[in-house]
Interface confidence: medium
């Protein structure tokens, strides 16, 4: 069977006027997953995103992440897209320093 990922979106200050937004998917099985940032309704090009490896997390499931740098104040233009085992979800950038994390339910 498959285990849906927990998706967690965070933000951190990068430089003056910029923030880094990171989308983490964890505790999923099998390891095949699509994780990408979308801006203005369309996926960002590969060269503007950084991906982590898909790694075992020690519980028989996997974890990975994708990050990109964006201009502060433009957070509403960005969403993290996740697809796993035929199910997909989108996750907004949290405002301020809060975190968003939740399971994607089948």
């Amino acid at each position: 069977g498959s285990v849906p990922p927990m998706v967690n979106v965070t933000r951190s200050e990068a430089s003056e006027g910029n923030i880094t937004v990171t989308c983490r998917a964890s505790s999923f099985y099998p390891r095949n997953i699509t994780l990408t940032w979308r801006q203005d309704g369309v996926s960002l090009s590969h060269d503007t995103q950084q991906w982590g490896d898909v790694l075992p997390d020690g519980n028989g499931t996997y974890q990975t992440w994708v990050a990109t740098r964006i201009c502060q104040g433009e957070e509403q233009r960005f969403t993290c897209y996740m697809e796993h085992s035929g199910n997909h979800s989108t996750h907004p950038v949290p405002s301020g320093n809060s975190h968003h994390h939740h399971h994607h339910h089948h």
Epitope: D40, V42, Q76
Partner: antibody, heavy 119, light 107 residues
């Protein structure tokens, strides 16, 4: 409802610049959305050209990047297409449209304006 | 770039028939697909977005399906007002691209 209306010269000479205007009513182009130009060639092929979004950021089709510019006049709620060094291959019906950020599909289009490039 | 291949290029059908138009993407577009209808001399009109969702005001005889790289638009009980050209468009990544179109003509 958002309404869009294209305008501009219907005939342009080769090597010159093509300039078109899209006038938007019913919504402020600085409020939200991506404001796009799309063209349809005589044999009906559709090509997305690019957009200017609510904050003034532009994004262009790489196939046109060296020739295209999309700008705006927020006081008139208009956005513009300029295409330089045109050839007869740029003869097309030019449409303006917009999309929301829940996905880049085009809910409404202008009526289109035919531009013929000919000497 | 993701290329969109539509088939057939044209078809002839009678009022009341069911027709299906297909669209194949050169890569996985994850259901980020729209369908448009265009009548002669008019602008394209949105029919479907997100691969399966009918736009406001679109009759229920239209339906759409698909996933990955393969998508289809089905018209049940074709009506006179359904004749025209149909285009698919992906919006997974830039540049946005359209299929070459399918012309639905009266038999």
């Amino acid at each position: 409802d958002v309404q869009l209306q294209e305008s501009g010269p219907g005939l342009v000479k080769p090597s010159q610049s093509l300039s078109l205007t899209c006038t938007v009513t019913g919504y402020s182009i600085t409020s939200d959305y991506a404001w796009n130009w799309i063209r349809q060639f005589p044999r009906n092929k559709l090509e997305w050209m690019g957009y200017i979004n609510y904050s003034g950021t532009t994004n262009y089709n790489p196939s046109l990047k060296s020739r295209i510019s999309i700008t705006r006049d927020t006081s008139k709620n208009q956005f513009f297409l300029q295409l330089i060094s045109v050839t007869t291959e740029d003869t097309a019906t030019y449409y303006c449209s917009y999309y929301r950020y829940d996905g880049a599909w085009f809910p409404y289009w202008g009526q289109g304006t035919l531009v013929t490039v000919s000497a | 770039d993701i290329q969109m291949t539509q088939s057939p290029a044209s078809l002839s059908a009678s009022v009341g028939e069911t027709v299906t138009i297909t669209c194949r993407a050169s890569g996985n577009i994850h259901n980020y697909l729209a369908w448009y209808q265009q009548k002669q001399g008019k602008s394209p009109q949105l029919l479907v977005y997100n691969a399966i969702m009918l736009a406001d005001g679109v009759p229920s005889r239209f339906s759409a399906s698909g996933s990955g790289t393969q998508y289809s638009l089905k018209i049940n009980s074709l009506q006179p007002e359904d004749f025209g050209s149909y285009y698919c468009q992906h919006f997974w990544s830039f540049p946005l691209t359209f299929g070459a179109g399918t012309k639905v003509e009266i038999k």
